[in-house]
């Protein structure tokens, strides 16, 4: 029995659960999912049974290994998943368990602004990355590209102060999880201030 | 990648033995059974037997104990199959096949086999 | 031991077909039935295990079902790469293994 292993998925695509075993004679392999029997495996007598059988178009063992496959994931797929070998020739059962996160593909994040002043030419104002279906475990960069020197901001807000005259910005949120990153649309300092430009003490959200 | 690399054509008289052998390589020789088959001309494939090179340990079809003796070498990663009492009937293609984890039964990667010719 | 009696023995078909192979166990085998193809001079070649399980890299266009004594291996649309003899082997429990003695699938 090893340590907890975590692993991490997609929606819509496959995770492999590693599993070895150096045992001659394996009479049966069982793999549970929060506590429900999954799939019960006797490799002796040539039977894999599924529980339930909407897993069975999703359950797999490539190279016919002991390792188990588990495809066209789900959100609800993530849990604590267990296996057990059992044999005669071992006093107590081989377990293993792992942790499995399911991850959605992140769509493309949006961009609020906050309330905007504009100050002896200098446009002040906050940009918030966030993302529509509150997807978990998201993690914001922000990218200010057109300074001499290229940005990067951690966190969902933006603090912004773009002086009138400077050369243009452009304003990009990344939003990332472990299984993938999506791109705002980008901001350009010059259009984002364009509203306060007239008043130059007006504010606006 | 996994390989099982057999022995070339044999011919023998009639009541002669034969040894072919079968040399793994890419996986964990000793923790897989591997099986023997044999495919006469016109005939059905025959399970002869398979082995656990692990420990030795050996499982017949009836019909060929006493005519085949598997045997294992782990040192070398290398089956033996050694047919005794040779005869017309014997005349055969044998195999050597890796059983998967999963299904003990089932047979994912063979060797090209050997051809056996028994004539007299 | 187990029979696997397997049917038809030959078929002709053509690139497209469906083609279905049949092949009954003498006695309840559970679902521990395989599925070899095996091309002239050449060793077989796994299919599928356990009955319905695809073993890794073989197309999708292979798919096999069955339970106790009935075994039906489907080739939803034959490829011509596919011309071949398929066998089926029951590997349940206690050895000896048997095989049926396999499905010619010629060109029509």
């Known amino acids: 029995s090893g340590p907890v292993k975590e692993l991490v998925g997609s929606v819509g695509g496959a995770v492999t659960f590693p599993l070895k075993s150096k045992v001659k004679q394996v009479d049966s392999i069982v793999w549970t999912f929060n506590t429900t029997p999954l799939v019960t495996i006797q490799p002796e007598g040539g039977t894999i049974i599924v529980t339930q059988n909407r897993n069975r178009e999703r359950v797999d063992f490539p190279d016919g290994g002991y390792s188990l496959k588990l495809s066209k994931l789900k959100k609800n797929d993530s849990g604590i998943y267990y296996v057990g070998i059992y044999s005669s020739s071992l006093q107590q059962p081989s377990t293993q368990e792992y942790v499995l996160h399911v991850y959605e593909h992140l769509s493309k994040p949006k961009v609020t602004m906050g309330l905007q002043s504009n100050k002896n030419g200098t446009c002040v104002t906050n940009l918030t990355c966030c993302m529509e279906h509150g997807e978990e475990d998201v993690i914001y960069t922000w990218k200010a590209l057109g300074q001499a020197a290229n940005e990067s901001h951690n966190g969902s807000i933006l603090p912004i102060s773009w002086r009138w005259g400077e050369s243009d910005m452009t304003f990009i949120c990344v939003a990332r999880n472990p299984v993938s990153r999506n791109f705002s649309s980008p901001i350009l300092a010059r259009k984002l201030c364009e509203g306060a430009a007239d008043d130059p003490d007006s504010s606006m959200v | 990648q996994v390989q099982l690399v057999q022995s070339g054509a044999e011919v023998k008289k009639p009541g002669a033995s034969v040894k072919v052998s079968c040399k793994a390589s890419?996986?964990?020789?000793?923790?897989?059974?591997m099986n023997w088959v044999r495919q006469a001309p016109g005939q059905c494939l025959e399970w002869i037997g398979r082995?656990?090179?692990?420990?030795?340990?050996?499982k017949y079809n009836g019909k060929f104990k006493g005519k085949a003796t598997l045997t294992a070498d782990k040192s070398t990663s290398t089956a033996y199959m050694e047919l005794s009492s040779l005869r017309s009937e014997d005349t055969a293609v044998y195999y050597c096949?890796?059983?998967?984890?999963?299904?003990?039964?089932?047979?994912?990667?063979w060797g090209q086999g050997t051809l056996v010719t028994v004539s007299s | 031991d187990i029979q696997m009696t397997q049917s038809p023995s030959s078929l002709s078909a053509s690139v497209g077909d469906r083609v279905t192979i049949t092949c009954k166990a003498s006695?309840?085998?559970?679902?521990?039935v395989a599925w070899y193809q095996q091309k002239p001079g050449k060793a077989p070649k796994l299919l599928i295990y356990s009955a319905s399980y695809r073993y890794t890299g073989v197309p999708d266009r292979f798919t096999g079902s069955g339970s106790g004594t009935d075994f039906t291996l489907t080739i939803s649309s034959l490829q011509p790469e596919d011309f071949a003899t398929y066998y089926c082997?029951?590997?349940?429990?206690?050895?000896?293994?048997?095989f049926g003695c396999g499905t010619k699938v010629e060109i029509k």
């Open positions: 082997q029951q590997h349940y429990s206690t050895p000896p293994y048997t």
């Open positions: 006695q309840d085998v559970s679902t521990a």
């Open positions: 082995i656990y090179p692990g420990d030795g340990d050996t």
């Open positions: 890419g996986y964990t020789f000793s923790s897989s059974w």
């Open positions: 096949a890796r059983s998967t984890m999963i299904a003990t039964g089932a047979m994912d990667y």
